[in-house]
């Protein structure tokens, strides 16, 4: 047990475990919308520089891809998998690995993936053969 | 025994500019991940920024990107944070802790040890 730690009055964002230690937010890539170079290939880097450290320790890193007539970009960002996001539920939350799948948007085509390991959202995936690959 | 002890803060008017030190003892320094963590009075804790131990690469909350710089001195084993252009919602006590070793998973990720606190006031 830590020997000091400062009391909250916000228990959502004062994350502990029975020990007594305290959570630690995920870090992740967070640049929100850039255009993106990123299209018909089975995996791409977000080319984003920012890592930020997520505002809650239960906020997860997401990425989302969009493709329509005028151009492509890459929205990387932290949300809490509670919340849907973009009108979707965050699926794949607890994945080590952030794998695209496909959601049905009007005019365009939009991919987006939910994952739980530091910057996961750096790498995305779209070949279905790294879905079932087991975490690192 | 695990010792950090802050310093630094204090009083400060509205885009000026503060430096905290951390002084860590009782672990290896160069083996750990720094963080600084702030709370405001009556809110809970906000994770403000983080250092790797070797190689020095820093992350930060939104709210401090491009005014807070975070660095350490691993010969000193002193963890630093330089605070400029700070703003009233800057206010808060801010708070050096050590990393547990090792995990990536954010469902494993700990913070072990903390500092007991150095006040910062921005106010004009």
């Known amino acids: 047990i830590p020997p000091h730690v400062p009391k909250s009055v916000n228990s959502d964002v004062m994350a502990s475990d029975n020990g007594g230690a305290v959570k630690l937010p995920q870090l992740c890539k967070f640049c929100d919308v850039r255009l993106s170079t990123c299209d018909n290939q089975k995996s791409c880097m977000s080319n984003c520089s920012i890592t930020a450290i997520c505002e809650k320790p239960h906020e997860v890193c997401v990425a989302v891809w969009r493709k329509n007539d005028k151009n492509i970009t890459l929205e990387t960002v932290c949300h809490d998998p509670k919340l849907t996001y973009h009108g979707f539920t965050l699926e794949d939350a607890a994945s080590p690995k952030c794998v695209m799948k496909e959601k049905k948007r009007a005019g365009e085509t939009f991919f987006m993936c939910a994952c739980n390991m530091e910057e996961c959202n750096d790498y995305i995936i779209f070949s279905e053969e790294y879905t079932t690959s087991s975490p690192d | 025994e695990v010792q950090l002890l802050e310093s630094g803060g204090g009083l400060v008017q509205p885009g000026g500019s503060l430096r905290l030190s951390c002084a860590a003892s009782g672990f290896t320094f160069t083996e750990y991940r720094m963080w600084w963590v702030r709370q405001a009075p009556g809110k809970g804790l906000e994770w403000v920024s983080a250092i790797e131990p070797i190689g020095n690469r820093t992350y930060y909350a939104r709210s401090v990107f491009g005014r807070f710089t975070i660095s350490r001195d691993n010969s000193k084993n002193t963890l630093y944070l330089q605070m400029n252009s700070l703003r009233a919602e800057d206010t808060a006590v801010y708070y050096c802790?050590?990393?547990?070793?090792?995990?990536?998973?954010?469902?494993?990720?700990?913070?072990?040890?903390w500092g007991q606190g150095t006040l910062v006031t921005v106010s004009s």
């Open positions: 802790a050590k990393q547990m070793p090792g995990q990536k998973w954010m469902a494993k990720s700990r913070f072990d040890y």
